[in-house]
C-alpha cells in the first residue's frame, strides 16, 4: 500500500530514452498519444510532473519476493492526465483520472546505470515501461537477466521551475 496519500516530493522533468530520444505527448482526437522521437534542436522538450511516493510492499503481494520500502512514482505530462500501465494490451497510455489514482498509475522507481532510471509496474512486478517501435510499451524483464537493457532505461532532465502544473 502507498504509505501516504501525498507525495514526499515532486519534480518537473523532461523524459528521454537511453539513446537521447525525447518522450513527447500530443493531443489527438480528444485523447493523448505518446511518442518517442528525435527532437529538432529548437523544439522545446515536453515536461512531466513526477510525484514520488513511498510504499511498504510485503513480499506476499508480489511474485518477485521484493519486500520493503519502495520509492514509487506517478508521471503526469498535463493536468489531470497520468501515464498508466495497460497490462492486458502491454501498452502505456495516458488517462484522465481523479485522485486517488489507480494502482496502474504507480511505478516502482529503479535507479540504473548511473543517472538513468527504470519504471516498474506496481500492478505487474517484472514488467517495465520500455521503448518498442518508437512507442512506449510494457516490457517483461526476466529478473535473472541484467535489468540494464537499454530499452527500459530513461533519463530525467529536471526543469527548474515551480511545479504547480504545466501545459
Amino acid at each position: 500500500s502507498i504509505t501516504g496519500i501525498s507525495p514526499i516530493t515532486e519534480s518537473l522533468a523532461s523524459l528521454s530514452t537511453y539513446n537521447d530520444q525525447s518522450i513527447t505527448f500530443a493531443l489527438e482526437d480528444e485523447s493523448y498519444e505518446i511518442y518517442v522521437e528525435d527532437l529538432k534542436k529548437d523544439k522545446k522538450k515536453d515536461k512531466v510532473l513526477l510525484s514520488y511516493y513511498e510504499s511498504q510492499h510485503p513480499s506476499s503481494e508480489s511474485g518477485d519476493g521484493v519486500d520493503g520500502k519502495m520509492l514509487m512514482v506517478t508521471l503526469s505530462p498535463t493536468k489531470d492526465f497520468w501515464l498508466q500501465a495497460n497490462n492486458k494490451e502491454h501498452s502505456v497510455e495516458l488517462h484522465k483520472c481523479e485522485k486517488p489514482l489507480p494502482d496502474q498509475a504507480f511505478f516502482v522507481l529503479h535507479n540504473r546505470s548511473f543517472n538513468c532510471v527504470s519504471f516498474e509496474c506496481k500492478t505487474d512486478p517484472g514488467v517495465f515501461i520500455g521503448v518498442k517501435d518508437n512507442h512506449l510499451a510494457l516490457i517483461k524483464v526476466d529478473y535473472s537477466e541484467n535489468l540494464g537493457s537499454e530499452n527500459i532505461l530513461f533519463k530525467l532532465s529536471e526543469i527548474l521551475e515551480h511545479h504547480h502544473h504545466h501545459h
Epitope: I8, T9, D67, G68
Partner: antibody, heavy 122, light 107 residues
Framework: QVQLVESGGGVVQPGRSLRLSCAAS????????LHWVRQSPGKGLEWVAL????????YYADSVKGRFTISRDNSKNTLYLQMNSLRPEDTAGYFC???????????????WGQGTLVTVSS | DIQMTQSPSSVSASVGDRVTITCRAS??????LAWYQQKPGKAPNLLIY???SLQSGVPSRFSGSGSGTDFTLTISSLQPEDFATYYC?????????FGPGTKVDIK
C-alpha cells in the same frame, strides 16, 4: 531489528589484499541495494561502492575502481568488499550501509554497521 | 561529481538552543538530500531524507527543508544527546557525495 556487522579489517601492507564482510539480519536482505562507505580517521565520509539488490549492477568510486570488488551472497545474507592493491590512502573505517529504498538510492542510507578499521601501512 | 559544502563547520550551543545548519550542492539535486548524525566512534544515523522527511524513530525537534541547491537542518531545541557531527549527503546524482560535516559542541 536491522543489524549490519562488519568484519575482516586489520593492518595490511601496501599492495596487499583484504576482504571485508558484512553480515545482515532483520530485513529482507535480497530486496535492498547495499553500499560500502569509508571514513578516514578524523575525517569525513566517502562513498565507496554499491551493489543492487540482485547483484546485477555494481558501481564504484573512481578512487577504488579496478582495485575493489563488491559482491553479495543473498543465500548467506552477506555483503563483501574485496580490496586489492591497497594503498596508504585506503586507511579508514569501512561501514556497510543499507539503502532506504529497495531499488533506488534516492533516499540515502537508513542502517549502518559499526564499521571495521583497515590500516594500510608498511 | 557534485560537491557538497556545509556551514558552519562547527557551532557552539547550549541545551535548549535552536541550531541551524546549511548545506549547499554545487548543482541542483531536486529534493534528494539526506542528513545524518554521527557521534565519536559510532556509525552515522539517518535523520532526514528527501530533504524534509523525518526518518522513523527520529525526534520531531529535527527538521529539514530546501530543494535544488540550498538545504537546511534545524534542531528546534537542542538536547544533551544532540551534541555530535552532522553530515548532509546528496542522493540525486551518481556518485553519492557527503558534505564535510558540522560539529555541534557545548558552549
Amino acid at each position: 531489528q536491522v543489524q549490519l556487522v562488519e568484519s575482516g579489517g586489520g593492518v595490511v601492507q601496501p599492495g596487499r589484499s583484504l576482504r571485508l564482510s558484512c553480515a545482515a539480519s532483520g530485513f529482507t536482505f535480497s530486496s535492498y541495494g547495499l553500499h560500502w562507505v569509508r571514513q578516514s580517521p578524523g575525517k569525513g565520509l566517502e562513498w565507496v561502492a554499491l551493489i543492487s539488490y540482485d547483484g546485477s549492477n555494481k558501481y564504484y568510486a573512481d578512487s577504488v575502481k579496478g582495485r575493489f570488488t563488491i559482491s553479495r551472497d543473498n543465500s548467506k545474507n552477506t555483503l563483501y568488499l574485496q580490496m586489492n592493491s591497497l594503498r596508504p590512502e585506503d586507511t579508514a573505517g569501512y561501514f556497510c550501509a543499507k539503502s532506504l529504498y529497495t531499488t533506488s538510492w534516492y533516499g540515502g542510507f537508513d542502517y549502518w554497521g559499526q564499521g571495521t578499521l583497515v590500516t594500510v601501512s608498511s | 561529481d557534485i560537491q557538497m559544502t556545509q556551514s558552519p563547520s562547527s557551532v557552539s550551543a547550549s541545551v535548549g538552543d535552536r541550531v541551524t545548519i546549511t548545506c549547499r550542492a554545487s548543482q541542483g539535486i531536486r529534493s534528494w538530500l539526506a542528513w545524518y548524525q554521527q557521534k565519536p566512534g559510532k556509525a552515522p544515523n539517518l535523520l532526514i531524507y528527501a530533504a524534509s522527511s523525518l526518518q522513523s524513530g527520529v525526534p520531531s525537534r529535527f527538521s529539514g527543508s530546501g530543494s535544488g541547491t540550498d538545504f537546511t537542518l534545524t534542531i528546534s531545541s537542542l538536547q544533551p544527546e544532540d551534541f555530535a557531527t552532522y553530515y548532509c549527503q546528496q542522493a540525486n546524482s551518481f556518485p553519492p557525495t557527503f558534505g564535510p560535516g558540522t560539529k555541534v559542541d557545548i558552549k
